[in-house]
Interface confidence: medium
């Protein structure tokens, strides 16, 4: 899983002190905007829970792997969904934090619920401020279920979701009818794609048995470890106040991880840091409990003591999770929890063990995922340990998975599972891209999509003249920079190929497919001039031009006409592919538009000097705007529009077009036709209750006319959310918490 943590500071007495920090432990995280290291993104997600607009939140980057969001001015700013996105390419991951108002009517007993496919999920909303009205449950902002206030059990409203499937995942909320959505209890349901203990495409693979509350990822079988734990199976505790996949991060402030909520990639969700619990993560674990949210019990044996951050601390002579193993029993030492090798390499793997009696070479073995047992080729015996070295046969992809080092002596046995990732050296799927060319040089982008695994450590560009048998020239380049191939021959084709490498022995991939790049021909030098033009319709223009007379053949393949619409900031290009042409008809232009026009000669891909520009105004078309547009709310789902016909019409109106948009909404506007042009009013139905809308309209004769003024109006009351505006009544299924 991607090493990405979203931290929420829950000191809520003062919203201005609240902050969210997203920390990435990924190599090269957030380096910038290039394709090899996209930046960390941290934002409030307003798609489901919307809060009143306030001053914009402040985003501060601290180096390449940390970003912090501040500037919350009032408690309602905090309520809702926040997300952090990090990781590159296929590893791009979103971590989500859901914040509930501590003063809400309803509070979640538990915010994050991670369940397995097919399980029954039970969401429990605790009554904090009672109202004797129904409770509305929503799923991702859409109405889902109603509970009557009589249905509260022990001061809680329960929503049972049987046989859940991955699409059931999302944000659920429980709200008293007619209460502010900010007083809702918000939950996050994460449904793993497999049943308990399984992972993989067909859920055929067995999870490694994640310890200390780690959750098995349904796609890759890795354990997503709670904050404060590390290792393939989350078997190792970090030092107090540390988190991250390798315990490399430290909680800010003098009180360590107190008052912080940690959110990790799905399917983990969010929890307090190790050693803390409570809705604001400010309570230390009770005696005998430890770990994230204090969910784990120590049950130490043989005189072990319970540490709320790491679990059992064993006295001398004992080890194991519960101090249940005697030090006489052999023990695997310092085994890395994860190793990475490249495909078809033959790596050496070391496994060290200690114990009494002392382990010897033959007592340590290595077991591959397919059950094959490897015996060590040599052992280094030191006073405190024996290190066995294993020569691994040529690695294949099937060797990816959990390997096991096992030591057996008369004192007992120990084993340690570790993950081996067999990585495929990257092979370009596409040829490099030509950016620009001149007669003696080519500028090439080596960034191409590739099969296999990143990260890319080096990029080699190989090139030679086409059909040549001479050796390839090679240039090693930085993955993120464009390359200039210099000292080339003009008008010559070059075969160019990319080779990518990833870190580690055997990380060089095969060469990618070749592409032919041709150096340019001489550039055209003649400057045409515009002889004249005339308008042949509201959207058609006839243009003619000339070239100076020069001795010798014409260096050019054709002409490029350019029309620049300054008002809209749009350029239209028309290619005339004959160098003998001196006239062209331009069609499909925009009526009533002021264009700047020029023409230039081209040869191959090179453009000659442009003619002096001409300015052309096309005649307008389409009727004027309707007048005096007015909107009036009729109900919680209907708004009536009235208007007056445009003046000075050039012909009979065929229809009106109404544009509807939610005020402040990010979605596309909706256009509705009013097909009876004699009408001067219409009713827009199927709108959402208590929602502000913007309307404007225009008339159509042969073409669409100018837009009217924009009017704004809100629907009334509190009722069903509609499916969308229409001119006939229609009920709906979806809506947003406004």
């Amino acid at each position: 899983a991607v090493d990405l943590t979203l931290l929420a500071n829950l000191r809520l007495t003062d919203p201005q002190r609240f902050f969210l920090t997203c920390v990435s432990g990924e190599a090269g995280a957030g380096r910038g905007s290039d394709a090899w290291g996209p930046p960390l993104l941290l934002e409030k997600d307003d798609r489901i829970v919307r809060t009143p607009p306030g001053p914009p939140l402040r985003l501060a980057r601290n180096g390449s792997h940390q970003v912090t969001l501040r500037g919350f001015s009032k408690p309602s700013d905090l309520v809702g969904v926040f997300s952090c996105v990090g990781g590159a390419g296929a590893r791009r991951t979103r971590v989500i934090y859901v914040h509930n108002s501590p003063g809400a009517h309803l509070l979640p007993d538990k915010v994050t619920h991670t369940v397995n496919k097919g399980d029954t999920a039970v969401l429990s909303a605790r009554v904090h401020k009672e109202k004797q009205t129904d409770v509305i449950w929503k799923s991702n902002g859409s109405y889902f279920y109603t509970l009557d206030w009589h249905e509260a059990q022990d001061g809680r409203f329960l929503l049972q979701l049987p046989n859940v499937q991955p699409p059931s995942s999302g944000i659920y909320s429980a709200t008293y009818l007619e209460a502010s959505p900010l007083g809702s209890a918000f939950f996050r349901l994460i449904v793993r794609g497999c049943g308990a203990g399984r992972w993989g495409p067909g859920c055929t693979k067995e999870c490694p048995g994640c310890l200390h509350g780690g959750v098995c990822h349904d796609h890759d079988g890795e354990c997503v470890c709670p904050p404060g734990f590390t290792g393939t199976r989350c078997e190792q505790a970090c030092r107090e106040g540390r988190f991250g996949q390798s315990c490399q991060e430290q909680c800010p402030g003098i009180s360590g991880c107190r008052g912080l909520t940690f959110c990790l990639p799905d399917p983990y969700g969010c929890s307090c840091g190790s050693g803390w619990r409570g809705s604001q993560c400010q309570e230390a674990c009770a005696p005998g409990h430890f770990g994230a949210d204090c969910r784990l019990q120590c049950q130490c044996q043989n005189g072990g003591t319970c540490d709320r951050f790491s679990g059992c601390v064993c006295p001398s002579g004992w080890h194991g999770v519960h101090c249940e193993k005697s030090d006489r029993i052999p023990q695997i030492l310092n085994m890395a929890s994860e190793l990475e090798f490249n495909l078809e390499t033959m790596p050496r793997i070391n496994c060290a063990a200690a114990g009494n009696p002392f382990p010897v070479r033959g007592s340590i073995e290595l077991r591959k995922p397919d059950g094959t047992v490897l015996l060590s080729t040599k052992a280094i015996v030191e006073p405190e340990k024996t290190t066995a070295e294993f020569e691994v046969p040529r690695l294949v992809l099937a060797d990816s998975g959990f390997w096991e080092c096992r030591v057996s002596t008369s004192g007992g046995q120990d084993s340690r599972r570790f993950k081996v990732n067999v990585k495929v050296p990257p092979v370009p799927l596409a040829a490099p891209r030509l950016l620009t060319k001149q007669s003696r040089q080519l500028v090439v982008s080596p960034l191409v999509s590739f099969s296999g695994d990143g990260p890319i450590s080096t990029v080699r560009l190989h090139y030679r003249p086409q059909d040549s048998t001479m050796d390839w020239s090679t240039i090693v380049v930085d993955p993120s920079e464009n390359v200039t191939l210099m000292n080339l021959r003009p008008k010559t084709g070059y075969s160019v190929r990319v080779q990518l490498s990833r870190p580690g022995e055997g990380g060089e991939g095969a060469w990618g497919p070749p592409t032919l790049m041709t150096t340019d021909c001489p550039e055209p030098l003649l400057q045409p001039w515009l002889e004249g033009w005339h308008v042949e319709g509201t959207d058609r223009l006839r243009v003619s031009w000339s070239l100076p007379l020069v001795p010798g053949p014409l260096v050019g393949d054709g002409f490029l006409l350019r029309l620049w619409d300054g008002t809209r900031g749009q350029e239209r290009r028309e290619n005339v592919s004959s160098p003998q042409a001196r006239t062209a008809l331009l069609t499909g232009l925009t009526p009533g538009t002021h264009y700047q026009l020029d023409v230039q000669l081209y040869h191959c891909t090179l453009l000659g000097p442009a003619s002096p520009p001409a300015h052309v105004l096309l005649p307008p078309s389409g009727p004027p705007a309707p007048r005096h547009l007015h909107a009036q709310a009729l109900s919680d789902s209907e708004i009536q529009l009235t208007w007056k016909h445009p003046e000075a019409l050039p012909g009979p109106i065929s229809k009106y077009v109404v544009e509807v948009q939610v005020a402040g909404g990010a979605g596309d506007p909706l256009w509705i036709d009013v097909d009876r042009p004699e009408e001067t009013s219409t009713i827009i139905r199927g709108l959402n209750a208590s929602t502000r809308y913007l309307f404007r309209m225009r008339a159509s004769i042969q073409g669409l006319g100018d837009w009217s003024n924009t009017v704004e109006e809100s629907t009334l009351g509190n009722g069903l959310q509609a499916e969308g505006p229409v001119q006939e009544s229609r009920a709906a299924e979806e809506g947003l918490d406004q």
Epitope: T146, H150, R730
Partner: antibody, heavy 113, light 115 residues
Framework: EVQLLESGGGLVQPGGSLRLSCAAS????????MGWVRQAPGKGLEWVSS????????HYADSVKGRFTISRDNSKNTLYLQMNSLRAEDTAVYYC??????????WGQGTLV | QSVLTQPASVSGSPGQSITISCTGT?????????VSWYQQHPGKAPKLIIS???NRPSGVSDRFSGSKSGNTASLTISGLQAEDDGDYYC???????????????FGGGTKLTVL
């Protein structure tokens, strides 16, 4: 295993009364909404009534409103339907069913009235 | 008279696919994603086979699938088998608003004959 067993059906004259019972087992009865659905001979299903877990909130089809009363005893895991002023058109097999969210997920075998 | 309209009967040969439609209004089928389907064999209680338009409860064959468009819901049974013979009822949760005035409406039922 969820089980629902109806009883109390029988022959009754128009204008008479009858009380149906439904004994529930295999699940936490007090946590679920429950309902009655009937089926006239050779005809389709018709929802009759439903009741919330606490018993404090009930709903009825228009055809039985004012004549039928649904109730429950959570301590006995039992659902009841008291039917008064019975009419010939109330003749049907009456099914007791557990309500989960927006549907009936388990049904009893029914009792004929 | 049932509130939701279903065809009285459909038939198909083993291995074929059939579809049963269920038409309501915007106050029931069209207004909610809460259509369920029940199978009933003669003399037996109804059995839930589809909930919430297209969700199959655990233990129900994946040959049964549901869908909805506008005011019409549909049940499709693929790879017909002799044991599919029986009556099929659609049902929709119906409510006038967000309040608890909850009702359920049923279709008149469709008799499926496997030839």
């Amino acid at each position: 295993e969820v089980q629902l067993l109806e009883s109390g059906g029988g022959l009754v004259q128009p204008g008479g009364s009858l009380r149906l019972s439904c004994a529930a087992s295999g699940f936490t009865f007090s946590s679920y909404k429950m309902g009655w659905v009937r089926q006239a001979p050779g005809k389709g299903l018709e929802w009759v009534s439903s009741i919330y877990p606490s018993g404090g909130w009930t709903h009825y089809a228009d055809s039985v409103k004012g004549r039928f009363t649904i109730s429950r005893d959570n301590s006995k895991n039992t659902l009841y339907l008291q039917m008064n002023s019975l009419r010939a058109e109330d003749t049907a097999v009456y099914y007791c069913a557990r309500v989960l969210l927006h549907y009936f997920d388990y049904w009893g075998q029914g009792t004929l009235v | 008279q049932s509130v939701l309209t279903q065809p009285a009967s459909v038939s198909g040969s083993p291995g074929q696919s059939i579809t049963i439609s269920c038409t309501g209004t915007s106050s029931d089928v069209g207004g909610y994603k809460y259509v369920s389907w029940y199978q009933q064999h003669p003399g037996k209680a109804p059995k839930l086979i589809i909930s919430d338009v297209n969700n199959r409860p655990s233990g129900v064959s994946d040959r049964f699938s549901g869908s909805k468009s506008g005011n019409t819901a549909s049940l499709t049974i693929s790879g017909l088998q002799a044991e599919d013979d029986g009556d099929y009822y659609c049902s929709s949760y119906a409510s006038s608003s967000y309040t608890s005035s909850t009702t359920w409406v049923f279709g008149g039922g469709t008799k499926l004959t496997v030839l």
